[in-house]
């Protein structure tokens, strides 16, 4: 699986360096946390255990998605 | 309404170069990946070139990698495919088309120009 | 590269008939596949994504089914204008790739 990759990058254009997933049953993971009033950091990679979800927090709100085909 | 529209094509000789383009309308152009498809003369259809929506990452299949270049203008809502050291197995229909996710993995090429045909012959 | 093989590569029938495409891969592909319709001197058209979902303005006559290697498109009564070459394509793992074509003539 090919994933993007990065770690805490303020945009997606920034996340483009392409990681070979190689474990079973790896998923490309995105993690986008925004802070009230500033920019949204973006990390992204392969992960074996990604569960999307979506958290807010009094200080703003971090959102994980997850995907499974190249590129995704 | 969406609508791609390629141009460029024509005959061209072996080992020489071509530059094809595909204006899109109707749609915001710099949020979406797009590929070049092509099909060759009573064939079926082959993937050739992606680009994704800002245009820093691009992929290729082996057949083509190293003499195709696929690049946009997000400005000009144009895509572009560049193409060096022709052979006569590059004749073909090209069609540039949109690529539209549903969900965070699936996607399909939803929307396709008319296509441009290049012949590459002696 | 996942090879995908479409059968039959032709085949002819009767309006009102149900017509079914198949589609196999050689890897697992999930739900990734996508049908396209191509009718004769014209552009290739999405037909159904996600292995079952219609496109917009897609006959409901149309529909997929399967999962993992093995996939169907089927028409479930066939009309004049549904002659057209059908492609299966997966959107799983690079290089993407395309079946080679099933031609659809009605008798």
């Known amino acids: 699986l090919l994933c993007y990759s990065c770690k805490a990058q303020v945009s997606n254009e920034d996340c483009l360096q392409v990681e070979n997933c190689t474990q079973l049953g790896e998923q490309c993971w995105t993690a986008r946390i925004r802070a009230v009033g500033l920019l949204t950091v973006i990390s992204k990679g392969c992960s074996l255990n990604c569960v999307d979800d979506s958290q807010d927090y009094y200080v703003g709100k971090k959102n994980i998605t997850c995907c499974d085909t190249d590129l995704c | 309404q969406v609508q791609l529209v390629e141009s460029g094509g024509g005959l061209v000789k072996p080992g020489g170069s071509l530059r094809l383009s595909c204006a899109a309308s109707g749609f915001t152009f710099s949020s979406y990946s797009m590929s070049w498809i092509r099909q060759a003369p009573g064939k079926g259809l082959e993937w050739v070139s992606y680009i994704n929506d800002s245009g820093g990452s691009t992929f290729y299949p082996d057949t083509v990698k190293g003499r195709f270049t696929i690049s946009r203008d997000n400005a000009k809502n144009s895509l572009y495919l560049q193409m060096n050291s022709l052979r006569a197995e590059d004749t073909a229909v090209y069609y540039c088309?949109?690529?539209?996710?549903?969900?965070?993995?699936?996607?399909?090429?939803?929307?396709w120009g008319q296509g441009t045909t290049v012949t590459v012959s002696s | 590269d996942i090879q995908m093989t479409q059968s039959p590569s032709s085949l002819s029938a009767s309006v009102g008939d149900r017509v079914t495409i198949t589609c196999g891969t050689s890897?697992?592909?999930?739900?990734?596949l996508n049908w396209y319709q191509q009718k004769p001197g014209k552009v290739p058209k999405l037909l159904i994504y996600?292995?079952?979902r219609l496109h917009s303005g897609v006959p409901s006559r149309f529909s997929g089914s399967g999962s993992g290697t093995d996939f169907t498109l089927t028409i479930s009564s066939l009309q004049p204008e549904d002659v057209a070459t059908y492609y299966c394509?997966?959107?799983?793992?690079?290089?993407?790739?395309f079946g080679g074509g099933t031609q659809l003539t009605v008798l």
């Open positions: 088309a949109r690529r539209m996710y549903y969900g965070n993995s699936h996607w399909h090429f939803d929307v």
């Open positions: 394509q997966q959107s799983k793992t690079l290089p993407w790739t």
């Open positions: 890897q697992d592909i999930n739900n990734y």
């Open positions: 996600y292995t079952s």
